[in-house]
């Protein structure tokens, strides 16, 4: 039988690398059962993380998983730095792994790179 | 449904580089994550990495300085390069998805035979 | 990488009898809070197919007569009855740690 506990898959050390300017959807995959539990965004400031209170979230249902998604619109420069998503469930505080989000500002780039050869480039 | 589709040469030359491409239909890689895997002649399978949703992507530390996978959105199509290969590369490769619950494979492609050969 | 050590590499079972297959990690499958282990079978000629996710949860679509157990390093699938269907090589993988590895392989045959 599936067991009913609520779990978050941000992968382990998981990176994202994106353009300044463009919009992003970064996804928390929360697994539950009955009833979906309240997920919050943060980002970390050195050991504290700082709840993410007027950001536009949004859930996404797809079998078998839920993702509460923290949107960017659009990417800016101190976007940069490491979330978390954690949710709260039977009194329980479950805390996902972090993810990293590397922003790179198109201002500063002599030239503006498509999304896919930054992504290869930057993760080559 | 999801289905992937992988394509490119059955035969390339030592020190050659491979490159093959996996075309996705019923999903857009823009969501979940896309992997490549090969399965060797005496039946053991590698993982060889993957590109995710945002463009990013992870390789095994074996390959990591032989192996890239980019990525066409518009096409919905993302690809393996292999650089100097050798005979040790011969082997079925597999592109599949991996559900980002749990991060198993739910769907896979049918492979298609590499053999590097002089 | 972790290794995940499947035993026997191969089997031959009657029909209609229990095939049971192991596979041991060499590090606790946990990081999640959950076991991401997982079971695929493969065909002559096919892909693998997922049967088993996330240790004992059933993929759609695949028979009750498969199921998984297991946690931590010490991981089973469970063939019960098998019929001649299910000749195949049985493959256990784990998600739990980059980079993500696979059992050898146990290639079941009928007796």
């Known amino acids: 039988k599936e067991s009913c506990d609520v779990q978050l898959y941000i992968k382990r050390q998981s990176e994202h690398s994106i353009l300044a300017g463009d919009p992003f959807e970064l996804e928390c995959p929360v697994k539950y059962c009955a009833n979906r539990p309240h997920v919050t965004w943060c980002k970390l400031n050195g050991t504290t993380c700082v709840k993410l209170e007027d950001r536009q979230t949004s859930w996404k249902e797809e079998k078998n998983i839920s993702f509460f998604i923290l949107h960017f619109e659009p990417v800016l420069p101190n976007d940069n730095g490491s979330y978390r998503c954690s949710a709260n469930f039977q009194r329980n505080l479950i805390e996902s792994h972090s993810t990293t989000l590397y922003v790179t500002d198109v201002k500063s780039a002599s030239e503006r790179p498509s999304k896919d050869e930054m992504a290869s480039r930057f993760w080559a | 449904e999801v289905q992937l589709q992988e394509s490119g040469p059955s035969l390339v030359k030592p020190s050659q580089t491979l490159s093959l491409t996996c075309s996705v239909t019923?999903?857009?890689?823009?969501?979940?994550?896309w992997n490549w895997i090969r399965k060797f002649p005496g039946n053991k399978l590698e993982y060889m990495g993957y590109i995710s949703y945002s463009g990013s992507t992870y390789f095994n530390p074996s390959l990591k300085s032989r192996i890239s996978i980019t990525r066409n959105t518009s096409k919905n199509q993302y690809y393996l390069q292999l650089n100097s290969v050798t005979t040790e590369d011969t082997a079925t490769y597999y592109c599949?998805?991996?559900?980002?619950?749990?991060?198993?494979?739910?769907?896979w492609g049918h492979g298609t035979t590499l053999t590097v050969s002089s | 990488d972790i290794v995940l050590t499947q035993s026997p590499a191969s089997l031959a079972v009657s029909l209609g009898q229990r095939a049971t297959i192991s596979c041991r990690a060499s590090e606790t499958i946990d990081s999640y809070g959950d076991s991401l282990m997982h079971w695929y079978q493969q065909k002559a000629g096919q892909p693998p197919k997922l049967l088993i996710y996330?240790?004992?949860n059933l993929e759609s679509g695949i028979p009750a007569r498969f199921s998984g157990s297991g946690s931590r390093t010490d991981f089973t699938l469970t063939i019960n009855p098998v019929e001649a269907d299910d000749v195949a090589t049985y493959y256990c993988?784990?998600?739990?740690?980059?980079?993500?590895?696979f059992g050898g392989g146990t290639k079941l045959e009928i007796k």
């Open positions: 019923g999903d857009s890689i823009t969501s979940a994550y």
């Open positions: 993988q784990q998600t739990d740690e980059d980079p993500y590895t």
């Open positions: 996330r240790a004992s």
């Open positions: 599949a998805r991996s559900h980002y619950y749990g991060y198993y494979f739910d769907y």
